[in-house]
């Protein structure tokens, strides 16, 4: 069985301020078991944008229903985009661990650029 890959097909996305950004991500396998998280930026200072396992993120909705057990589409929508949302977003697969889940594989990233609202 081939190892899971995290695919972010869009290298960049351009969204007008006030609109909704769709950031696409799919996994190629259900194995290993574990959640997906989305981050803006990389490294220790990265910002958590969405965590499948915990919490409610008011501006973020998933494109597909993650409660479905065979789901492999982890794309998200971020509403009411502002210039402060610009950056590179990474879709990251975690492997279930105890006590903490372990980062398993990251997508290549999608750069979100924000176009100013026409005046």
């Amino acid at each position: 069985e081939e190892e899971l890959q995290v695919i972010q097909p869009d290298k960049s996305v351009l969204v007008a301020a006030g609109e909704t950004a769709t950031l696409r991500c799919t996994a190629t396998s259900l194995i290993p078991v574990g959640p997906i998280q989305w981050f803006r930026g990389a490294g220790p200072g990265r910002e958590l944008i969405y965590n499948q396992k915990e919490g409610h993120f008011p501006r973020v909705t998933t494109v597909s229903d993650l409660t479905k057990r065979n789901n492999m589409d982890f794309s998200i929508r971020i509403s009411n985009i502002t210039p402060a949302d610009a950056g590179t977003y990474y879709c990251v697969k975690f492997r279930k661990g105890s006590p903490d889940d372990v980062e398993f594989k990251s997508g290549a990233g999608t750069e979100l650029s924000v176009r100013a609202k026409p005046s």
């Epitope: 959640p35 965590n51 499948q52 396992k53 915990e54 919490g55 409610h56 008011p58 909705t61 998933t62 229903d65 993650l66 409660t67 479905k68 279930k96 105890s98 006590p99 903490d100």
Partner: antibody, heavy 120, light 107 residues
């Protein structure tokens, strides 16, 4: 098999405190968000509070905010509900339930409940 | 808050007949609607999750449908053991909310 067993209910006077406990077994407790739901006598279900698997995210119903505190101890496989400043309208059966992964998931197992009666 | 309204409040159906319960949401909950069964003196039991998915071990006579604001739970052929109160519940956004419940009885 999955088991959730609530305890700590009883009769208490208005304004007093009570601490409910829920003992979990038969599953990896630290993988699951946990919830308290209550049901007043002859009434429907009301969500009270929820806590994520690592306690990072906690939410309360407006009706209990500032009075109730939900917590968990993953090393002991236990969920708690500390209830302060109890009111007559808090009288209900209190159920603990588990929720796999994130906020959108359903409550797939429930305990049998523990009765809390607030009365002078 | 998202208000869930079930209809009817109670329902009497002959054995072997179809029972249909509706749940309307005050705003879209996408597909994050779940259905529970509660028999007298027992805790609730999950029947259907995310609008249309049958929970493991639940008889196939139970089914769910809908998305957005309108959802339906159907019992295709009512059995005596289905006498219970049925609740819908949304998990699209906090706070979690339940419908007021629908009591199903045998006619």
């Amino acid at each position: 098999q999955v088991q959730l067993v609530e305890s700590g209910g009883g009769v208490v006077q208005p304004g007093r405190s009570l601490r409910l406990s829920c003992a979990a077994s038969g599953f990896t407790f630290s993988d699951y968000g946990m919830i308290w739901v209550r049901q007043a006598p002859g009434k429907g279900l009301e969500w009270v509070a929820s806590i994520s698997s690592s306690s990072s995210y906690i939410y309360y119903a407006d009706s209990v905010k500032g009075r109730f505190t939900i917590s968990r101890d993953n090393s002991k496989n236990r969920l708690y509900l500390q209830m302060n400043s109890l009111r007559a309208e808090d009288t209900a059966v209190y159920y603990c339930a588990r929720r796999y992964y994130g906020f959108n998931y359903p409550f797939d197992y429930w305990g049998q409940g523990t009765m809390v009666t607030v009365s002078s | 808050d998202t208000v869930l309204t079930q209809s009817p409040d109670s329902l009497a159906v002959s054995l072997g007949q179809r029972a249909t319960i509706n749940c309307g949401a005050s705003k879209s909950v996408r597909t994050y609607m779940h259905w529970y069964q509660q028999k007298p003196g027992q805790q609730p039991k999950l029947l259907i999750y995310s609008a249309s998915n049958l929970e493991a071990g639940v008889p196939s006579r139970f089914s769910g449908s809908g998305s957005g604001t309108d959802f339906t739970l159907t019992i295709s052929s009512l059995q005596a053991e289905d006498v219970a109160v049925y609740y819908c519940q949304q998990s699209n956004e906090p706070p979690y909310t339940f419908g007021q419940g629908t009591k199903v009885e045998i006619k």
